[in-house]
Amino acid sequence: TQNKALPENIKYGIVLDAGSSHTSLYIYKWPAEKENDTGVVHQVEECRVKGPGISKYVQKVNEIGIYLTDCMERAREVIPRSQHQETPVYLGATAGMRLLRMESEELADRVLDVVERSLSNYPFDFQGARIITGQEEGAYGWITINYLLGKFSQKTRWFSIVPYETNNQETFGALDLGGASTQITFVPQNQTTESPDNALQFRLYGKDYNVYTHSFLCYGKDQALWQKLAKDIQVASNEILRDPCFHPGYKKVVNVSDLYKTPCTKRFEMTLPFQQFEIQGIGNYQQCHQSVLELFNTSYCPYSQCAFNGIFLPPLQGDFGAFSAFYFVMNFLNLTSEKVSQEKVTEMMKKFCSQPWEEIKTSYAGVKEKYLSEYCFSGTYILSLLLQGYHFTADSWEHIHFIGKIQGSDAGWTLGYMLNLTNMIPAEQPLSTPLSHSTYV
């Protein structure tokens, strides 16, 4: 048997991310005998479920089963049959379901109940569906990126796996942007916190981490847009909204009932003399930026320093990984390069937003118009959130790394969630075994 590797015992895990705008299924695998090592779990598949987020199925709960079928069947194909029964399946729902629960706990429970019944029909080890808290979402995102970057490993490497990985063990902060919420999580320089609600303590691989985290509900990119429209229509003189966040020549009719459907626009709700209004794009970055800033209340802060809306934010520290919609939007706009300064990003956004809608449609013919129309707003919103909301500066901008994947695994909360629920992140540093199962003998 000289130089023959013994067959590895591989384990699998499945996590469904039930986000506000869509659901994605992630399949992870790892060698069983190394499950307490850092960095051994990796993603083998992502399956995006066709359709919107599960909260939209509140009136059609009997369709949840077919909605999830293709991705669950894909998991059945990818994972060897012999492993099905021991493969855990977790579903975590985020801000879309948090908002539904705010409207009706009964309806949210009904959706989750049908989801659970549907997922229980598969041959996997279903571990439940739940709405995770914003704090969990932030914490698990932070764990994911630092796990994948090797920040919890005690072994120092002479090589770097990813361009922005340094050999130091300083953790990265995590910036996550979804459709309905956004999270900021990092280890501040000062260990003491003024706001216990935003403090988390972890002991991972023998090291203590005091982490700051906050999730801003209603400040995901989709809900922020609804907020902005609800705010701006208040002062419109008629049913035409000239909007600087959309390209010149862009037109779209919005139902007032849709605008006020979400709890996120409640603070702007008023009786309007029309049932519909038309957005008419004028494509002006500076004016769009000003409009977005009005969503952040910075006039009140009961702490030494705040982000916005009176929420404590300690001084920013170290490098940050910005993922999910931070990455998707900036990647579309071709602004993820480490070399692009904040000033250059702003300049590019000004240019992009001012381009006529017809020109944009021609340049990006393959992109669905619904998404295409919102990149000007989303890019502007990201800049406003990072600079004015979180107080990044032109200098600290270079510490933000827009990350889609790290070593083939998506940056996001799902991996951290699974690592935690499968007890794969030990509190203490595991003792290294002289020979692992896959060692050459």
């Epitope: 705008s21 066709k50 919107p52 987020g53 079928t69 293709d70 459709g179």
Partner: nanobody
């Protein structure tokens, strides 16, 4: 615009079988979801069985193990094989073709086509 025409309904004794067909006038290859719904008198329309473009299926608990949905894209047809029929299966059966919208706003479905329905009566 896709038109759907159901056939195969009728009167059958309890324990008997029927095969419903749904012929589409357009190309169903591009339609992601095809399903059968039913509506009994005085009751809400309910989803019986559905099939995706990849051929994956899903059934209401009440028909699991008795009904089988299938699709033949070359014939632009969807079938519902109904075995071990019971009196409570009596209803008008409707064929439905749809796709979900990926959007967070507006309608859940991007498009939604329905047939006229075919009556199934299970009685001795």
């Amino acid at each position: 615009e896709v038109q759907l025409l159901e056939s195969g309904g009728g009167l059958v004794q309890p324990g008997g079988s029927l095969r419903l067909s749904c012929a589409a006038s357009g190309d169903i290859f591009s339609i992601n979801y095809m399903s059968w719904y039913r509506q009994a008198p005085g009751k809400e329309r309910e989803l019986v069985a559905a099939i995706t473009g990849r051929g994956n299926t899903n059934y209401a608990d009440s028909v699991k193990g008795r009904f089988t949905i299938s699709r033949d894209n070359s014939k632009n047809t969807v079938y519902l094989q109904m075995n071990s029929l019971r009196a409570e299966d009596t209803a008008v059966y409707y064929c439905n073709a749809w796709d979900y919208s990926d959007y967070d706003e507006g309608p859940l479905r991007e498009y939604d086509y329905w047939g006229q329905g075919t009556q199934v009566t299970v009685s001795s």
